[in-house]
Amino acid sequence: EDGGPACYGGFDLYFILDKSGSVLHHWNEIYYFVEQLAHRFISPQLRMSFIVFSTRGTTLMKLTEDREQIRQGLEELQKVLPGGDTYMHEGFERASEQIYYENSQGYRTASVIIALTDGELHEDLFFYSEREANRSRDLGAIVYCVGVKDFNETQLARIADSKDHVFPVNDGFQALQGIIHSILKKSCIEILAAEPSTICAGESFQVVVRGNGFRHARNVDRVLCSFKINDSVTLNEKPFAVEDTYLLCPAPILKEVGMKAALQVSMNDGLSFISSSVIITTTHCSDGS
């Protein structure tokens, strides 16, 4: 877009946005924050959804990878007129439902939720929000929270995956632009390359998976390398090493020349997967090479 940082990860990204009465005079800042962030997730395999909440949760834009639909979704988002209470759990309900139904036909795509709110949640509403965020997590989502102005950081740390998944914006709504870089860096899980990208047919290999965000998992012991072979069989392998910018994984033995393995990564023991355009292919290797 503007030469700024970008994310090439293929996953489902949900924005859950507070449109309660207290953000009435700050909706433009929220909109521009989402717009700037949305344009930086550039994988053709990335899908996005916009959900707003006040006294009700509403899905403004269902999950889509279509950039024209995303543009139209952003237009709808810009037109939102805030008002009502801060029923954050209603937003998470809409996200959980989409995660469940979108992934209940077989292949499970990883989900990342970025939830933004500006106020402290009263006791019951906090309980419901935490409960619904836990349901999203049970469905495999990674949950981040952006807190602006009068938020309660302790509450948001329990709604998000951890304290490290909370982005506090203490200087008011105009400071939202300042966290785009850090939220992009933290929420982006991407597979950029595999080394080697060509392996010998019938031989065992180790593959270095280059990328970002591999240690964003709630539990790094649950990170898996996944190889989708010839668009059919999927083999999951436990990595030998998990670092933020690379994984060291055993590659499956691919018996025949010309076989292709598309690289995926799971952050939750195979519950869902981050996809990529990275392919490992097999070639014939003569003895001694």
Epitope: E90, E97, Y101, S104, Q105, D138, L139, L271
Partner: antibody, heavy 118, light 107 residues
Framework: EVQLVQSGGGLVKPGGSLRLSCAAS????????MNWVRQAPGKGLEWVSS????????YYADSVKGRFTISRDNAKNSLYLQMNSLRAEDTAVYYC???????????WGQGTLVTVSS | NIQMTQSPSSVSASVGDTVTISCRAS??????LGWYQQRPGEAPKLLIY???HLQSGVPSRFSGSGSGTDFVLTITSLQPEDFATYYC?????????FGGGTKLEIK
């Protein structure tokens, strides 16, 4: 009190139609997905159909696909099952059930008997 | 489509006994499995969700375990009201599927 009250069952001839209703009360109906499940006399439970909270996602069992239609009216807190081209093997007690996917069906209607016979 | 197989189809036990009912999925379903109790003439009742979580209001003598393809419902210290039919159900993917049921009878 959270409850689901069913109506619309009865005796119908093969090839006929019937519409089942399920009225919800005591909870925010528009926030929940809903299911229809049936049980033939003396048999086990069989899932029939599911609908998401805003009707965006709808699924049917192969045995009823093309003949049954699930729908809901959130303004009326009601769930429906329109059953067309009924067959003898559709004879069963039909239950509506509230669901929070993927946590299971936590509230059930009392059931309504549909008998398909000439 | 995922098939759910329950065993045994029926079991006899006495008040105070412990019983276990098994459920096997034809393919992995993570932990998206529920257990239901159905008494004669009544609607089913959710006992356990997500394989091991006790539904609110259900006595702690009911417990569930398992993940992937193999699951177990355990009822300890059987009470007279526990004699009923039990069903497992997968919610991992559509079409949703129930097991064939296990009838728990008084010995």
């Amino acid at each position: 009190e959270v409850q689901l009250v069913q109506s619309g069952g009865g005796l119908v001839k093969p090839g006929g139609s019937l519409r089942l209703s399920c009225a919800a009360s005591g909870f925010t109906f528009s926030s929940y997905s809903m299911n229809w499940v049936r049980q033939a006399p003396g048999k086990g439970l069989e899932w029939v159909s599911s609908i998401s909270s805003s009707s965006s996602y709808i699924y049917y069992a192969d045995s009823v696909k093309g003949r049954f239609t699930i729908s809901r009216d959130n303004a009326k807190n009601s769930l429906y099952l329109q059953m067309n081209s009924l067959r003898a093997e559709d004879t069963a007690v039909y239950y509506c059930a509230r669901v929070r996917p993927p946590y299971g069906m936590d509230v059930w209607g009392q059931g309504t008997l549909v008998t398909v016979s000439s | 489509n995922i098939q759910m197989t329950q065993s045994p189809s029926s079991v006899s036990a006495s008040v105070g006994d412990t019983v276990t009912i098994s459920c096997r999925a034809s393919q992995g379903i993570s932990n998206w499995l529920g257990w239901y109790q159905q008494r004669p003439g009544e609607a089913p009742k959710l006992l356990i969700y997500a394989a091991s979580h006790l539904q609110s209001g259900v006595p702690s003598r009911f417990s569930g375990s398992g993940s992937g393809t193999d699951f177990v419902l355990t009822i300890t210290s059987l009470q007279p009201e526990d004699f009923a039919t039990y069903y497992c159900q997968q919610s991992n993917s559509f079409p949703l599927a129930f097991g064939g049921g296990t009838k728990l009878e008084i010995k």
